[in-house]
Amino acid sequence: EPHSLRYNLTVLSWDGSVQSGFLAEVHLDGQPFLRYDRQKCRAKPQGQWAEDVLGNKTWDRETRDLTGNGKDLRMTLAHIKDQKEGLHSLQEIRVCEIHEDNSTRSSQHFYYDGELFLSQNLETEEWTVPQSSRAQTLAMNVRNFLKEDAMKTKTHYHAMHADCLQELRRYLESGVVLRRTVPPMVNVTRSEASEGNITVTCRASSFYPRNIILTWRQDGVSLSHDTQQWGDVLPDGNGTYQTWVATRICRGEEQRFTCYMEHSGNHSTHPVPSGKVLVLQSHWQHHHHHHGLNDIFEAQKIEWHE
């Protein structure tokens, strides 16, 4: 997988008036890395591993960059003409990647009220607009504003691309991201399925990097894909990942089944616990949280794009 840096900024308006402040999160290699602390007006690392990336250096540069980006996005939102009453959001996601062959990719995406309306490849400067008429109108609005703004010249987009890559390389130089391995915690649970059957679920949590093999075995042999259900490998908010795999088995045959896990060159096997059947409500229902937007406008539903 490529190394990536992703900026996720959101600004809000209420009854046509752009609100002060902004929400910002930065993800490094898909993990929450920085967020903008509105109270302290500073970029803050998310967890110990993020702190380790910069070591004893300050986060002033990140604070300056996020503040500047937030200000730009507020100005952009102010130029969107169709703002009706109530709450509206403008979200910008900027991503840059360095691939194994050292090739790079950069892109920028704008969302209005959670709907994508404009994308740009920052290397080719090619714009993409979805088909819907609303998206076309919004995109025209924003592109016109960006063209008017002297700052949004060709050099600006090259700079955005270069700056993002420069930052990504700076973070990678620390070696923390490349070196870091956190082994998973694995646990197996069982739940009532139907008459004579039980569902066994194997969960792996708190691991890094995200690549993992998690599969059920019967008598030491991996079950076929169609007899297993997998959950997505998702960030758990602590700079690590979580996932699960489940299968249905006949009661009384538990001893034949083990969950096999392989991660970063290490492996383990985990038997099905015997004894009382636990009745679980559901298998790890993953909810997409709104990362702080709820704090401001609890009653309003703003879609947050991951």
Epitope: G220, V221, S222, H267, P271
Partner: antibody, heavy 118, light 107 residues
Framework: QVQLQQSGPELVKPGASVKVSCKAS????????IYWVKQSHGKSLEWIGY????????VYNQKFKGKATLTVDKSSSTAYMHLNSLTSEDSAVYYC???????????WGQGTLVTVSA | DIQMTQTTSSLSASLGDRVTISCRAS??????LNWYQQKPDGTVKLLIY???RLHSGVPSRFSGSGSGTDYSLTISNLEQEDIATYFC?????????FGSGTKLEIK
């Protein structure tokens, strides 16, 4: 490549016990089960049981419960089968086998001949 | 326990022949059927697993088929090195059980 090297032939007296070893090489020992199979002279094969080397978990053929005990030594990548209270019925060639995770008994040891005789 | 029956205990064939060895289970084993080759020196090798999947390194002249309770192993072009005893084995239900074997000889 995967190899299972079994211990040499054993001649034991009735009532005694014997421990057959199976040393694995060419793969990560704790990744895959070790299975044991019996073949009496000129007869078919009988599955005895298997062990998960990672955690020592065992599953036995009911017929061999109390007769065979399966263990492993992770440090030497060796699996053992202990047979007790031997009788002439236990005279046979004993095989260990392992899996590649996709099929049972994928790779086999060369077999160990156990002869029970007074 | 599931009984695995190989009705033909020995079989004579000529080099180049197409040979089929059959195996019957006492109940449905859902394709969990494997075939093994045992050479006269006692060496055992996996040939086919899950009814028809060829184990890596096994010559393509070996093939397997079947479903439910009836299964077969076919050698399409018999070679000298195929002289051995062939065992079927079910992996569907514990305890795992083997057929009594079919000894293949050259005419």
């Amino acid at each position: 490549q995967v190899q299972l090297q079994q211990s040499g032939p054993e001649l034991v007296k009735p009532g005694a016990s014997v421990k057959v070893s199976c040393k694995a090489s060419g793969y990560a020992f704790t990744k895959y089960n070790i299975y044991w199979v019996k073949q009496s002279h000129g007869k078919s094969l009988e599955w005895i049981g298997y062990i998960d080397p990672y955690n020592g978990g065992t599953v036995y053929n009911q017929k061999f419960k109390g007769k065979a005990t399966l263990t492993v030594d992770k440090s030497s990548s060796t699996a053992y089968m202990h047979l007790n209270s031997l009788t002439s019925e236990d005279s046979a060639v004993y095989y260990c086998a392992t899996t590649d995770g996709y099929s049972l008994f994928t790779y086999w040891g060369q077999g160990t001949l156990v002869t029970v005789s007074a | 326990d599931i009984q695995m029956t190989q009705t033909t205990s020995s079989l004579s064939a000529s080099l180049g022949d197409r040979v089929t060895i059959s195996c019957r289970a006492s109940q449905d084993i859902s394709n969990y059927l494997n075939w093994y080759q045992q050479k006269p020196d006692g060496t055992v090798k996996l040939l086919i697993y899950y009814t028809s999947r060829l184990h890596s390194g096994v010559p393509s002249r070996f093939s397997g088929s079947g479903s439910g309770t009836d299964y077969s192993l076919t050698i399409s072009n018999l070679e000298q090195e195929d002289i051995a005893t062939y065992f079927c084995q079910q992996g569907n239900t514990l305890p795992f059980t083997f057929g009594s074997g079919t000894k293949l000889e050259i005419k």
